[in-house]
Interface confidence: low
């Protein structure tokens, strides 16, 4: 190390702080007894500037006169090389040529403003040091500014450059003065333009209007007086991405034309005194205002379903989805159906509040046709019309080989054949899906998607849930009928957690009914394809028997007519997703009481 | 998931600054508008303002010349700084989670800052 | 500035439905939102967007928002539900909150 000197010294004149262009004389020296041995001219020093040998000297000392040393700090370390042995490091020392100040930069922060200066010091020379900044302009004007603070990177020389000769050159240069001499930065030259910065524009407001169809507005603001340029930026409170525009002479005010309704918007202001010359001023304090509504655009996606209530009467089950954003262009106060029987022209209004969905009760004869809009403060969009027909009549649109298969936790990929005739016909497809549930499905959500003719596929990912089974309907639709094919579907799936539970046999002509209570749909974990039902001897050792049953939603009991009669069986049933069986459900001891044949 | 956590001194004197911070953990700060409300023993809430995560900021007018909300999205925390405060000031701040449609989803549990001498 | 305004206290018995209305100036207009508080504890959203419902919110609560009233409703109220209410909406760039209303259930 280098202050581990123990062998020797190393000693720097005129000093290990220097100016620029200055030459030293380095020496190194052994101290008594610390050669390879006493005959000097066995004792080799050689001196390094950092790790290049640049002299060396046979004796108890070497001296070295060195020029041309770098800015900033150089290492010399001094050596011992005896011979058969490595060398000794003896000690050395760091010589800092001191740096002049640099990068002096002036600039005045608005008209009224005054001009300050700001440059870099250089390397720390840990000497006391002066700084003295001065500034010259037109007739032989000076002004002079001092700061006896050693980390001293700034002075305000409180004076304000005005416009009167905006022209006019002036030039500032910084002196640092210490016991080595005194040091100047390259002196910086500049105009009034050139270093002037406004102040950022203020008082920013905005004024919508309305222009045909568009929402124009109009940003308004104040600045100081002799700004030329402004630039712009504004965009929506929840983007990162600024839209910018440059304006010269706009004199405060501003318009913008390309506003989205109904968005708040962040609007910021910065201006500049002359094309190419000084710099912008800061960005303004951020102005943020909600641009005003418009009526909507766009048209719902409306979908329908039919239920038969008796001779007479028909439920329909209206479903819409909700506009985009953009579309909206507002706040939905409302939808408006509108409900017209086509054979008598009845109409029938209602505006629904908080729901995508409508349900009325119809009767079974005339023809009928829905429309749907949505509203909000400032008008209506297109209404969405549909004529109401039954979905599934036509067999000869019926799309065919409908498959469902799962393609990831909470996606299933439907996919199916064209309608085998009629196939010109179909103006396009809807896939329809909802979670199968047994019993009364009115409440359950419905989806859909709609597909265009030259589709035989659909990736349906919308409420999809793992370990849940869909009733999917694909729906091929032509002007004034539709087709339909069904299938069950699911995503992710395991087998069913338990089987089904028998709660009943009951003995009907020498065979037996079955019936049980159906799996919890929770249970279920995924669509079910197969009941099975074991039966065997009780107490026998062989192998169960055992009959499977297609999955049908509404079924819950079966007959088997195998049974020997006085003879006890157990039976038990399972459940079978495509992924297996489930464990098996209670068991049920039984004797058949008939004859024997 | 997410968890809000408000800290900072439980006193502070009059006319001095009161400083809390909202640390959000289990989720990012990102993509969301963050918002200091306080609620003074006995009253209602009171919305100081909100910070989205580029460091734009809104403020209640009412509280704005005294209030500054900031983000550090790298510790995934944002704070508020409410100066000169008096007796008035006493209260539980909570941090909360907005989302564009002006609702706040998510509340931390709330502290209470005393301001007293 | 704008102002929601709330009514101090509402009661109702067990099981019955109560309502919980929130005025303010064209509120119609904006979105609503509810919270209900018990003591000692943060506020919870229970109403968003005037009538959504976030997940593991009971059904029992609904809202509807329209001209210049928002209503929150409590269908088969429970004595758990038992809280302090308040309504929020934004206007003018500022989030507003009403005063609070206290649910008794008796």
């Known amino acids: 190390k280098i202050d581990e000197c123990k062998r020797g010294d190393v000693t720097v004149k005129p000093s290990r702080v220097i100016l620029l262009g200055s030459t030293v004389n380095i020496s190194c020296s052994l101290k008594p007894r610390q050669g390879c041995s006493p005959y000097s001219r066995r004792n080799k020093l050689i001196l390094y500037k950092f790790d290049r040998r640049i002299n060396f000297h046979h004796g108890h000392s070497l001296n070295a006169q060195v020029t041309g040393l770098p800015l900033g700090t150089t290492l010399f370390v001094c050596k011992l090389a005896c011979i058969n042995s490595d060398e000794i490091q003896i000690c050395g020392a760091e010589i800092l040529v001191g740096e002049q100040p640099q990068n002096l930069s002036c600039i005045q922060k608005g008209e009224q403003g005054t001009v300050a200066c700001t440059w870099e010091r250089g390397q720390d020379t840990h000497l006391y040091t002066e700084y003295t900044l001065q500034l010259s302009g037109p007739k032989n004007l000076t002004w002079q500014k001092q700061c006896k603070d050693h980390y001293c990177d700034y002075l305000d020389f409180g004076i304000n450059l005005t416009p009167e000769s905006p022209e006019s050159n002036f030039t500032a240069k910084v002196t640092a003065v210490n016991s080595l001499g005194s040091s100047s930065s390259f002196p910086s030259t500049f105009t009034f333009l050139d270093i002037v910065r406004p102040l950022p524009p203020w008082d920013i407001r905005i004024k919508f209007q309305k222009a045909s169809s568009v929402s124009r507005c109009t940003l308004y603001w104040r600045d100081e007086g002799l700004v030329l340029l402004n630039r712009l930026r504004y965009r929506p409170s929840n983007s990162r991405h600024w839209n910018m525009v440059n304006v010269t002479e706009a004199r405060g005010r501003h318009d913008l034309l390309d506003l989205k309704p109904f968005t708040e918007y962040e609007f910021q202001i910065s201006s500049k005194l002359h094309l190419y010359k000084g710099s912008w001023s800061d960005w303004s304090e951020t102005l943020r205002a909600q641009t005003p509504e418009e009526e909507p655009t766009g048209m719902l996606d409306v979908w329908y379903m039919k239920r038969h209530i008796d001779y007479s009467r028909q439920q329909i089950s209206l479903f819409w989805k909700n506009l985009s954003v953009s579309e909206a262009r507002g706040k939905i106060l409302h939808y408006q159906v509108t409900l017209q029987e086509l054979t008598g022209g009845k109409v029938m209004t209602q505006n629904i509040t908080g729901h995508t969905s409508w349900t009325t009760v119809i009767s079974r004869t005339g023809n009928w046709a829905v429309a749907v809009s949505a509203a909000n403060s400032k008008g209506n969009s297109l209404p969405t019309r549909i004529n109401i027909m039954n979905l599934c009549e036509a067999g000869l649109l019926a799309p065919h080989q409908v498959s469902a298969n799962s393609e990831s936790m909470d996606s299933i990929l439907v996919t199916w054949q064209p309608p085998r005739k009629d196939l010109s016909a179909v103006q396009e497809y809807v896939v329809e899906w909802r979670q199968l549930h047994p019993g009364d499905d009115t409440q359950i959500p419905l989806n859909w998607l709609r597909s265009p003719p030259y589709n035989v596929s659909a990736l349906i990912s919308e409420n999809i849930k793992p370990y849940t089974c869909y009733e999917i309907r694909v729906y091929a639709l032509s002007e004034d009928q539709g087709g339909c094919s069904s299938i069950l579907g699911n995503s992710e799936h395991k087998a069913p957690l338990s089987g089904p539970h028998i709660n009943a046999i009951t003995e009907e002509k020498g065979s037996i009914l079955i019936s049980w209570n159906s799996i919890p749909v929770q249970e279920q974990m995924g669509c079910l394809l197969h009941y099975r039902i074991y039966w065997k001897e009780r107490d026998s050792n062989s192998q169960p028997q055992l009959c499977e049953i297609p999955y049908r939603v509404s079924q819950n009991s079966h007959p088997i007519n195998s049974l020997q009669p006085r003879v006890t069986y157990v039976l038990w049933m399972t459940a079978l997703t495509a992924a297996g069986e489930s464990s098996q459900g209670n068991e049920r001891e039984f004797c058949l009481q008939g004859k024997a044949n | 998931q997410v968890q809000l956590q408000e800290s900072g001194p439980g006193l502070v004197k009059p006319s001095e600054t009161l400083s809390l911070t909202c640390t959000v953990s289990?989720?990012?700060?990102?993509?969301?508008?963050w918002s200091w409300i306080r609620q003074p023993p006995g009253k209602g809430l009171e919305w100081f303002g909100y910070?989205?995560?580029?460091?734009?900021?809104n403020y209640n007018p009412s509280l704005k010349s005294r209030v500054t909300i900031s983000v550090d999205t790298s510790k995934n925390q944002f704070s508020l700084k409410l100066s000169s405060v008096t007796a008035a000031d006493t209260a539980v701040y909570y941090c909360a989670r907005g989302s564009y449609f002006w609702y706040f989803d998510l509340w931390g549990r709330g502290t209470l800052v005393t301001v007293s001498s | 500035s704008y102002e929601l305004t709330q009514p101090p206290s509402v009661s109702v018995s067990p099981g019955q439905t109560a309502s919980i209305t929130c005025s303010g100036d064209k509120l119609g207009a904006k979105y609503a939102s509810w919270y209900h508080q018990k003591p000692g504890q943060s506020p919870v959203l229970v109403i968003y967007?005037?009538?959504k419902r976030p997940s593991g919110i009971p059904e029992r609560f609904s809202g509807s928002n329209s001209g210049n009233t928002a209503t929150l409703t409590i269908s088969g109220t429970q004595a758990m539900d038992e809280a302090d209410y308040y309504c929020?909406?934004?206007?003018?760039?500022?989030?507003?909150f009403g005063g609070g209303t206290k649910l008794t259930v008796l």
């Open positions: 289990g989720g990012s700060i990102s993509s969301y508008y």
């Open positions: 967007q005037d009538t």
């Open positions: 929020q909406a934004w206007d003018s760039s500022t989030v507003v």
């Open positions: 910070i989205y995560d580029s460091g734009s900021t």
